[in-house]
């Protein structure tokens, strides 16, 4: 999704709400654009997961390890 006139109007916007599993909303984000390596400044952002940078939004998102949820994969999924 390399449209050069696209605005990062969701710059700073994270995937999902605090109660959502970021891994799920990352899939939704993929329709809007592809991912790149997270900037180094976000290396500690995702607690139990890995960071991906949403190119269209210019913001980090987390793909949680199994059994973890939350924007930063910071919570144990009690239903896992």
């Amino acid at each position: 999704d390399g449209n050069s006139t696209r605005s990062p109007e969701t710059n700073g916007l994270l995937c999902g709400d605090p109660e959502e599993n970021c891994a799920a909303t990352t899939t939704q984000s993929k329709r809007k654009g592809h991912f790149s390596r997270c900037p180094k400044q976000y290396k500690h952002y995702c607690i139990k997961g890995r960071c991906r940078f949403v190119v269209a939004e210019q913001t980090p998102s987390c793909v949680c390890d199994e059994g973890y949820i939350g924007a930063r994969c910071e919570r144990v999924d009690l239903f896992y």
Partner: antibody, heavy 116, light 106 residues
Framework: QVQLLESGGGLVQPGGSLRLSCAAS????????ISWVRQAPGKGLEWVSY????????NYADSVKGRFTISRDNSKNTLYLQMNSLRAEDTAVYYC?????????WGQGTLVTVSS | DIQMTQSPSSLSASVGDRVTITCRAS??????LGWYQQKPGKAPKLLIY???SLQSGVPSRFSGSGSGTDFTLTISSLQPEDFATYYC????????FGQGTKVEIK
């Protein structure tokens, strides 16, 4: 339209404290990272700090680490910067800006002067 | 920390000129680079993000290019409202700005 309005600047003595506020409107504040960026008189831009959407993740420039604290109140659509142990070199216009990586909307800035 | 070096620090140009400003990072930042325009007494305005993507509402005479360590902002035909100071900013390893390039009327 997106608006960011800083307040709380003023004259303070070295070693003193000040709390800046940034009132946001025109967008869903609780979904965005927000930053503070400053500019000393006649100088360039310097990133100060950012905070993520829910206030769980913050970072600071080395020059302010341990002295400044960023926070937010999503119920009030407001960002804060608590500045302690202020130094002459902290004199600058302080801008709040939307975003953590790059900054697509900026406030008009508030001037902080640290002088005896 | 990553240092950003802009050149030139200032330049004089005329309306209609093609203007090029360069920015060099002290280490590779992929394409994590933005360009801003600032006029005296005003807040900066985002022009370009991700090295080459034009921010919404910004005239198409502005363009950005580069990746890794070397980046360029080009104004294809300078307009009266373009006289300002321009800053690059990397956002790979924290957020650091170049020292600025002042574009003045010749």
């Amino acid at each position: 339209q997106v608006q960011l309005l800083e307040s709380g600047g003023g004259l303070v003595q070295p070693g003193g404290s000040l709390r800046l506020s940034c009132a946001a409107s025109g967008f869903t504040f609780s979904r965005y990272w927000i930053s503070w960026v400053r500019q000393a008189p006649g100088k360039g831009l310097e990133w100060v700090s950012y905070i993520d959407s829910w206030g769980s993740y913050t970072n600071y420039a080395d020059s302010v680490k341990g002295r400044f604290t960023i926070s937010r109140d999503n119920s009030k659509n407001t960002l804060y910067l608590q500045m302690n142990s202020l130094r002459a070199e902290d004199t600058a216009v302080y801008y709040c800006a939307r975003g953590g990586s790059l900054f697509d909307y900026w406030g008009q800035g508030t001037l902080v002067t640290v002088s005896s | 920390d990553i240092q950003m070096t802009q050149s030139p620090s200032s330049l004089s140009a005329s309306v209609g000129d093609r203007v090029t400003i360069t920015c060099r990072a002290s280490q590779g930042i992929i394409s994590y680079l933005g360009w801003y325009q600032q006029k005296p007494g005003k807040a900066p305005k985002l022009l370009i993000y991700a090295a080459s993507s034009l921010q919404s509402g910004v005239p198409s005479r502005f363009s950005g290019s580069g990746s890794g360590t070397d980046f360029t902002l080009t104004i294809s035909s300078l307009q009266p409202e373009d006289f300002a100071t321009y800053y690059c900013q990397q956002y790979d390893d924290w957020d650091t700005f170049g020292q600025g390039t002042k574009v003045e009327i010749k």
